[in-house]
């Protein structure tokens, strides 16, 4: 099992954290798959996008997502790290003008069309177990991560005080 630590510690600080620049520090295209190698795909249906978690057929092309990384500063009185308490926030865009959003009321992950500046619901705190294995935590709801539930993306609460198996919130990034 993989543990996500520090979830409770910074709950208030995360709500108060600010994106230090309006421009991302880096951006790149990658395909997104689950820890169990299922692909995250996006389909246009009835003028809105649906998100699926599925096994691709051999040689089927993976959908790409534009990941934009932003630096986020913790208020020094909250983090204890002075000017040094930085996190990486990420936004995920599978197609122009559409971004993944956290719908905390419905515990769902949705694709919304919107203009910049993006709302807080489009920002996720990046955690990683290794360079290419990551988790996405809601900026608007600390302790809640994008995860896989019933072959769909959903918001999943991770209680760090319990020894939970959190493979369902782990995602792999690859350029292929």
């Amino acid at each position: 099992a993989f543990g996500i630590s520090g979830v409770q510690k910074y709950t208030r600080a995360l709500h108060d954290s600010s994106i230090t620049g309006i421009s991302p520090i880096t951006e790149y295209l990658a395909s997104l798959s689950t820890y169990n190698d299922q692909s995250i795909t996006f389909a246009l249906e009835d003028e809105s996008y649906e998100i699926y978690v599925e096994d691709l057929k051999k040689d089927e092309k993976k959908d790409k997502v534009l990941l934009s990384y932003y630096e986020s500063q913790h208020p020094s009185n909250e983090s204890g790290d002075g000017v040094d308490g930085k996190m990486l926030m990420v936004t995920l865009s599978p197609t122009k003008d559409f971004w993944l959003h956290a719908n905390n009321k419905e515990h769902s992950v949705e694709l919304h069309k919107c203009e910049k500046p993006l709302p807080d619901q489009a920002f996720f705190v990046l955690h990683n177990m290794h360079s290419n294995c990551v988790s996405f935590e809601c900026k608007t709801d600390p302790g809640v991560f994008i995860g896989v539930k019933d072959n769909h993306l959903a918001l999943i609460k991770v209680d760090s005080s319990e020894n939970l198996c959190t493979e369902n919130i782990l995602f792999k990034l690859s350029e292929t």
Partner: antibody, heavy 121, light 106 residues
Framework: EVQLVETGGGLVQPGRSLKLSCVAS????????MYWIRQAPGMGLEWVSS????????YYLDSVKGRFTISRNNAENTVYLQMNSLRSEDTATYYC??????????????WGQGTLVTVSS | DIQMTQSPSVLSASVGDRVTLSCKAS??????LDWYQQKVGEAPKLLIY???NLQTGIPSRFSGSGSGTDYTLTISSLQPEDVATYFC????????FGQGTKVEIK
């Protein structure tokens, strides 16, 4: 001010063990990945080992796997490198380093001054 | 495993010169690349992260660029205090340093 202080280096015979410690201060230790990087005399830098912020995930350079163990004590703001079955090619200055961002394994933002490990008979 | 190859191994230039150091990865590393400066007898220091972001406190004469497999560190006007060895480092898949480029003053 962020500080990392390594201790535990010294002269050791091949096949013996040594434990390095790195005490951190000036930041919230439990939020950051920590690393050991080494540099043989007159040579380049070589990543040795990594540990994530809660200590649940560890990674090693192939040549030290099964011999070295990285661990951390978040209550004491300390990261360790237990080195067993030491070889002459492990002779190097060992640096402790801290990640750049909370929760991620990207970049070595801060480094200690290093501690020299000499493996020789 | 990803290999990082730096060139040249040694670079001699005059004070005020524009200096370019190269780093090539064996695979696409998605801009997950840093540059570190190490002066003789000192610990390394982070200069540039994520290819082109200047670390706090580093002079603006240092800049980074690149994508895919090819990356560059540029010193726009070489200063005596820039004499050091410079290492590139990738963290896209595992963690790997280049072998270093030693920068000297002519």
């Amino acid at each position: 001010e962020v500080q990392l202080v390594e201790t535990g280096g010294g002269l050791v015979q091949p096949g013996r063990s040594l434990k390095l410690s790195c005490v951190a201060s000036g930041f919230t230790f439990s939020n950051y990945w920590m690393y050991w990087i080494r540099q043989a005399p007159g040579m380049g830098l070589e990543w040795v080992s990594s540990i994530n912020n809660d200590g649940g995930n560890t990674y090693y350079l192939d040549s030290v796997k099964g011999r070295f163990t990285i661990s951390r004590n978040n209550a004491e703001n300390t990261v360790y490198l237990q080195m067993n079955s030491l070889r002459s090619e492990d002779t190097a200055t060992y640096y402790c380093a801290r990640g750049h961002y909370y929760y991620t394994s990207y970049s070595f933002a801060y480094w200690g001054q290093g501690t020299l490990v000499t493996v020789s008979s | 495993d990803i290999q990082m190859t730096q060139s040249p191994s040694v670079l001699s230039a005059s004070v005020g010169d524009r200096v370019t150091l190269s780093c090539k990865a064996s695979h696409n590393i998605n801009k997950h690349l840093d540059w570190y400066q190490q002066k003789v007898g000192e610990a390394p220091k982070l200069l540039i992260y994520f290819t082109n972001n200047l670390q706090t406190g580093i002079p603006s004469r240092f800049s980074g660029s690149g994508s895919g497999t090819d990356y560059t560190l540029t010193i726009s006007s070489l200063q005596p205090e820039d004499v050091a060895t410079y290492f590139c480092f990738q963290y896209n898949s595992g963690w790997t340093f280049g072998q270093g480029t030693k920068v000297e003053i002519k």
